[in-house]
Interface confidence: low
């Protein structure tokens, strides 16, 4: 490494683009797990990804800070991208979540290692 520049931490977390396929898959997986664990009658989906980072280890650790919004899709209805967000004040609900997802791309597996959410 050049003088005056600290060596990059090998395997340290680095910023990632939300457009990356791996990040998109990790996001979909995390939001899916969030909905699965939630007893809310409405599905939630990502309003925005505030920050995305990844760490190359044996697989890939994704660290995602996500703002979630409550949609009008209920119960057995698909959790699809075209579900509009609630706009009624009494039904509107946002959550801010930090997800850590461990992906092993060559195995096609993902695990939600950490998930902390709070109402926004």
């Amino acid at each position: 490494s050049s003088p005056g520049k600290p060596p990059r931490l090998v395997g340290g977390p680095m910023d990632a683009s939300v457009e990356e396929e791996g990040v998109r898959r990790a996001l979909d997986f995390a939001v899916g797990e969030y909905n699965k664990a939630s007893n809310d009658m409405y599905h939630s989906r990502a309003l925005q990804v505030v920050r995305a980072r990844k760490q190359i280890v044996a697989g890939v650790n994704y660290f995602l800070d996500v703002e979630l919004g409550r949609t009008t899709c209920t119960k057995t209805q698909p959790n699809l991208d075209n579900c509009p967000f609630h706009d009624q004040p009494h039904l509107k609900r946002k959550a801010f979540c930090s997800f850590q997802i461990y992906a092993v791309p060559w195995q096609g597996t993902m695990t939600l290692s950490k998930s902390t959410c709070q109402d926004a």
């Epitope: 699965k36 009008t72 057995t76 209805q77 959790n79 699809l80 509009p84």
Partner: antibody, heavy 113, light 107 residues
Framework: QVQLQQPGSELVRPGTSVKLSCRAS????????MHWVKQRHGQGLEWLGN????????NYEENFKTKGTLTVDTSSSTVYMHLSSLTSEDSAVYYC??????WGQGTTLTVSA | DIQMNQSPSSLSASLGDTITITCHAS??????LGWFQQKPENIPKLLIY???TLHTGVPSRFSGSGSGTVFTLTISSPQPEDIATYYC?????????FGAGTKLEIK
Amino acid sequence: QVQLQQPGSELVRPGTSVKLSCRASGYTFTSYWMHWVKQRHGQGLEWLGNVDPGSGTTNYEENFKTKGTLTVDTSSSTVYMHLSSLTSEDSAVYYCTAGFDYWGQGTTLTVSA
Amino acid sequence: DIQMNQSPSSLSASLGDTITITCHASQNINVWLGWFQQKPENIPKLLIYKASTLHTGVPSRFSGSGSGTVFTLTISSPQPEDIATYYCQQGQTYPLTFGAGTKLEIK
């Protein structure tokens, strides 16, 4: 309390069209997608399509795309299903359901000469 | 389209029995599955959503389980008022599809 009001029955001639209504009350109309489900006599349930009353967004079962159209009148909290080119195969009970939580009593459609 | 294969098509149970109805999805639907009850000459009623969450007001003798492609509806000690046809429905993707139904009779 929540109510979905549907006409009890409709009798129409083959080849004509019909507009079935579903009037919602007792909840925020835009809170639920409205689905339509068909049930022929003694048969199972068949999902036809749905509409989001807030945006007018629709989804249809593939075969239903050439048969029906779903529309919304937010001023009267009513969802409509327009069925065209009716045949005896369209004779059935048609239910509207808000998010599968609340169901109308169903409209019995009879297509007969 | 996702096919929902429901079995058995009919069954007869006694009051003390535990009965199980199975639904097989033709592809992975995660937990996006609902169970409906339709009593004779009546409208359908949602019993369970998200595979295992009991809908408001549904008796606890009803329970649901499963994820992926195999799901079950269990009724512990069915009551005479449980005489009905039960349908599963997938909500993973459009078009939404129902199983063909299971008709329950009480001996």
